[in-house]
């Protein structure tokens, strides 16, 4: 039998064992988080699958993910939301220690999809393990990009109190308007619920005394946030290694001096 013709995309294909991975992650998450015990993981997988299976992978909409978003509804306590941009690993290390703060990937839907790739094909029930659309080279309305845009928007919309964001001080654009944080989350914080955004600018491994809160891109972020009637604060984290160490052991005498 000749293999059926399959669309060739520029991006890597669906992560191997994708359905099993999503289902296993869901089961694990609901076991660890008592408030999500009511979630039926088979229904979650069905809703996830329904968002992209049999659909042309360059024509996915936020609407496609609404059934999944509904099943994964979760709230973060006020003052406990941590957003991040281009510095995922440190943000996750932080919330692993500071257990009462949450990134999107600490929530069910973010946890399910973190580091995974997926896409289907128009008019077939197959998952494409060979290739998926690349955001730049193929299209932006692909299953993965639309998923993260959808859940990031929701995560920002539900945030309240003081929201924190971790930004990478080693990038040329510390705040990048084209990142998910800059293009989605910033614009979906609700001024009636969010009093302030506090940016933590994480310095690279090299020692430095410069105040990166004075960076032009941070000033741009401040301007965007202030125009939305949300207060803005910025802190330099000069020593990320010490920062994490002091989150773990705040009583440590060396934590009285700067981080």
């Amino acid at each position: 039998v000749l293999p059926r013709w399959r669309q060739q995309w520029s991006g890597s294909g669906t992560t191997s064992r994708f359905p099993e991975t999503v289902l296993a992650r869901c089961v694990k998450y609901t076991e660890v988080h008592p408030e999500m015990r009511h979630v039926d993981c088979q229904s979650v997988w069905d809703a996830f699958k329904g968002a992209f299976i049999s659909k042309y992978p360059c024509n996915i909409t936020e609407e496609d993910y609404q059934p999944l978003v509904k099943l994964g509804t979760q709230t973060v306590p006020c003052n406990k939301t941590l957003l991040w941009s281009r510095i995922k690993d440190l943000a996750h290390q932080f919330t692993q220690v500071q257990r009462d703060m949450f990134t999107l990937e600490d929530m069910l839907l973010g946890y399910l999809a973190d580091d995974l790739t997926w896409c289907g094909e128009f008019n077939t029930f197959e998952i494409n393990y060979q290739s998926c659309p690349d955001w730049r080279k193929d299209c932006s309305n692909n299953p993965v990009s639309v998923f993260w845009k959808t859940v990031s928007r929701r995560f920002a919309e539900t945030a309240c109190g003081v929201v924190h964001v971790m930004l990478n001080g080693s990038r040329s654009k510390i705040f990048d308007k084209n990142s998910t944080f800059g293009s989605v989350e910033v614009h979906n914080l609700q001024p009636e619920k969010v009093q302030a955004l506090e940016a933590w600018v994480i310095h690279g491994g090299r020692e430095d005394s410069r105040d990166l809160c004075q960076d032009p891109t941070i000033k741009e972020l401040e301007s965007i946030i202030s125009k939305r009637n949300i207060r803005f604060f910025c802190k330099n984290i000069y020593r990320p290694d010490k920062f994490l160490q002091c989150v773990k052991n705040p009583e440590d005498s060396s934590c009285l001096s700067g981080i």
């Epitope: 430095d208 005394s209 410069r210 105040d211 000069y238 001096s257």
Partner: antibody, heavy 119, light 112 residues
Framework: QVQLQQSVSELRSPGSSVKLSCKDF?????????MSWVRQKPGHGFEWIGD????????FYGEKFEDKAKLDADTVSNTAYLELTSLSSEDSAIYYC???????????WGQGTLVAVSA | DIVMTQTPLSLPVGLGDQASISCRSS???????????LHWYLQKPGQSPKLLIY???NRFSGVPDRFSGSGSGTDFTLKISRVEAEDLGVYFC?????????FGGGTKLEIK
């Protein structure tokens, strides 16, 4: 040994511009080390103009020099540049480039470029 | 901007003597990252400055141990335990705790 080599002296008339260069012979550290420019005027001591981190092009200027100086760097030739505009006699000085040795510490200095502005 | 004030302006010393130069900043140089970015440079006639001491008390590579630095907050001192002929020149303190980096006016070390 010479680590930073600066361009030769420049004589300019008021109102003109000049672009000074500073070649770093340590190609490994150049992209990821801030390069500062400092000027020394007789009787005025040293003034920090600004610095640039070549690999990402991040620049800090001293407030006094924001409209006077333009910093640039080329990571292919490992060369930093300082352009001075609207020159006046007040800008006559020796201009040094200095690469940081550790974070925020000027450890290695070029030999300096004398800029003389005269009608 | 932080103002760095050095004293004395001129310091005549005999070879083998101890020399002491003071540097005072207009505000504390203790940075929020826990470091104090106060440094000392020597500029010999016709040459560019050379780093001697960084972050108050650390000798830069190749700097003889007769040079030492001390101080905290706003008051700092450079000591040369036994002055040699090659030590003559102008000594500058500098801070890089707060932008813009600023420099002291210099202290000229000369033979008595």
């Amino acid at each position: 040994q010479v680590q930073l080599q600066q361009s030769v002296s420049e004589l300019r008339s008021p109102g003109s511009s000049v672009k000074l260069s500073c070649k770093d012979f340590d190609s490994e550290v150049f992209p990821t080390s801030y390069m500062s420019w400092v000027r020394q005027k007789p009787g005025h001591g040293f003034e920090w103009i600004g610095d640039i981190l070549p690999n990402i092009g991040r620049i800090f200027y001293g407030e006094k020099f924001e409209d006077k100086a333009k910093l640039d760097a080329d990571t292919v030739s490992n060369t930093a540049y300082l352009e001075l505009t609207s020159l006046s006699s007040e800008d006559s000085a020796i201009y040094y480039c200095a690469r940081e040795a550790y974070g925020s510490i000027l450890g290695y200095w070029g030999q300096g470029t004398l800029v003389a502005v005269s009608a | 901007d932080i103002v760095m004030t050095q004293t004395p302006l001129s310091l005549p010393v005999g070879l083998g003597d101890q020399a002491s130069i003071s540097c005072r900043s207009s505000q504390s140089l203790l940075h929020s990252n826990g470091n104090t970015y106060l440094h000392w440079y020597l500029q010999k006639p016709g040459q560019s400055p050379k780093l001697l001491i960084y972050k108050v008390s650390n000798r830069f590579s190749g700097v003889p141990d007769r040079f030492s630095g001390s101080g905290s907050g706003t008051d700092f001192t450079l000591k040369i335990s036994r002055v040699e002929a090659e030590d003559l020149g102008v000594y500058f303190c500098s801070q890089s705790s707060h932008l813009p980096w600023t420099f002291g006016g210099g202290t000229k070390l000369e033979i008595k």
